[in-house]
Amino acid sequence: MEKALKIDTPQQGSIQDINHRVWVLQDQTLIAVPRKDRMSPVTIALISCRHVETLEKDRGNPIYLGLNGLNLCLMCAKVGDQPTLQLKEKDIMDLYNQPEPVKSFLFYHSQSGRNSTFESVAFPGWFIAVSSEGGCPLILTQELGKANTTDFGLTMLF
C-alpha cells in the first residue's frame, strides 16, 4: 500500500565506514578518505520509496540516496556486464514523487546495530562498498569480505 503521508524534504545524514573514513566528492566521484581537518565530507540526502508494495519484502527499507544540495543521486547501471555505481544529476524529490519506483536509483537500506548496508534494488546482491585500502571511489560489489567494506555508519542529522 502506498505510504499515505507525503514527505516534502529528504532526511539528511552523514556516513562513515568502520575505519572512520568519510565520503568526499572529488571530480564528480564519491571517494572514501580518512577524516581530516578542513575537509568537507558530503551530507547525504535520503528518502524512502513510496511504493514499497511493488518491491521485494524483507530486504531492507528501499531508499533513494543523494548528495544534499547538489542535485546528484547515486544510481546503479551496467557497464558492459558489470553493475557499477554512478552519480547522476537528478533531483531526489523527483525520484520520490514518481508513480513508480525508479529501481536504478534505489537501495535496500538494512541496519544491524550501528551498521548500515546499501544493496542495489536493480542488481540484488550488489552492495555499495569501499576498498579496504581507502582513498578509492565507492563501488558496487558482490564480494562481502576483507577486500571491500560494505558496512557503514549512518548518522541522521535531522
Epitope: 500500500m1 502506498e2 499515505a4 507525503k6 511504493h51 508494495e53 511493488t54 518491491l55 521485494e56 547501471a77 523527483d94 525520484l95 514523487n97 514518481q98 508513480p99 513508480e100 525508479v102 529501481k103 536504478s104 536493480a122
Partner: antibody
C-alpha cells in the same frame, strides 16, 4: 466482475473544461493495492496515459498535461473524475478509464478498461 | 512520436506465427521496467493481453506469449486466427518522463 463506465459530454468548446466521470461497479474503489487511471486515444492514433489516483486522493499526472489536469475521487459513490481545462482540438479523443494494477517487480498496468467515450472539441 | 517504437503493421496467414517488436531505451524498458501488451479489437477498448513481459491473464490463449531482452520486448502469436486481427500496444514506464508510456501500436492483418 469489475466494470468501469465513463460518462460525460461528448462535445466541448475550445478553451472550456472537459469533465468526465468513471463509475466503478463489481468492486470497491477503496482497495489498498489499486490506482484508478485515465488514458486517451485521439482518432486513428495511439494511447496516452493522462494520470492516476489512489483512493486516498493521491494523484500522479503526465507532466506535459499536469497544468491542465485534475483527477479526483469520490469513494462514497465509487467514482473518480477527470477535468481537463483549456481544451483545444488536439484534446479530441476517446477517453478511457481503467483500474491501474500492480505486481511485485513490474510497473503498473491497466486492467480492465471502460468502453471509452469520444469527446470532440469543437465550436 | 511514441516513446516505445513498434512496427506500424504486420501480417500473416492463418496458422502462421508472427512477432511484434517494442523497442525502448535506457530510461524505460532498459531501466528494469517490464513490458505489458494490450489487444484492441476494432471499435473496442484495449484489453490486457500480457503483463510483466510474459504472463498471461486468465482467459488469454497460450498462443500469445511475450519476452523481453535489454531495451526491447516482443509479442509472439502462433497459430494465427482471423479473430486476432487487431491493434496491439506495448506499455511500460519511463522515469525520465515520469509517466507510463505506450508504443504507437501495430496493426495485425490476418491474410
Amino acid at each position: 466482475e469489475l466494470q468501469l463506465q465513463e460518462s460525460g459530454p461528448g462535445l466541448v468548446k475550445p478553451s472550456e473544461t472537459l469533465s468526465l466521470t468513471c463509475t466503478v461497479s463489481g468492486g470497491s474503489i477503496s482497495t489498498s493495492s489499486d490506482y484508478w487511471g485515465w488514458i486517451r486515444q485521439p482518432p486513428g492514433k495511439g494511447l496516452e496515459w493522462i494520470g492516476s489516483i489512489y483512493y486516498t486522493g493521491n494523484t500522479y499526472y503526465l507532466p506535459s498535461l499536469k497544468s491542465r489536469v485534475t483527477i479526483s475521487v469520490d469513494t462514497s459513490k465509487n467514482q473518480f473524475s477527470l477535468k481537463l481545462s483549456s481544451v483545444t482540438a488536439a484534446d479530441t479523443a476517446v477517453y478511457y478509464c481503467s483500474r491501474v494494477r500492480y505486481g511485485v517487480g513490474v510497473p503498473r498496468y491497466f486492467d480492465p478498461w471502460g468502453q471509452g467515450t469520444l469527446v470532440t472539441v469543437s465550436s | 512520436e511514441s516513446v516505445l517504437t513498434q512496427p506500424p503493421s504486420v501480417s500473416g496467414a492463418p496458422g502462421q506465427r508472427v512477432t511484434i517488436s517494442c523497442t525502448g531505451s535506457s530510461s524505460n524498458i532498459g531501466a528494469h521496467y517490464d513490458v505489458h501488451w494490450y489487444q484492441q479489437l476494432p471499435g473496442t477498448a484495449p484489453k490486457l493481453l500480457i503483463y510483466g513481459n510474459d504472463n498471461r491473464p486468465s482467459g488469454v490463449p497460450d498462443r500469445f506469449s511475450g519476452s523481453k531482452s535489454g531495451t526491447s520486448a516482443s509479442l509472439a502469436i502462433t497459430g494465427l486466427q482471423a479473430e486476432d486481427e487487431a491493434d496491439y500496444y506495448c506499455q511500460s514506464y519511463d522515469y525520465s518522463l515520469s509517466g507510463y508510456v505506450f508504443g504507437g501500436g501495430t496493426k495485425l492483418t490476418v491474410l
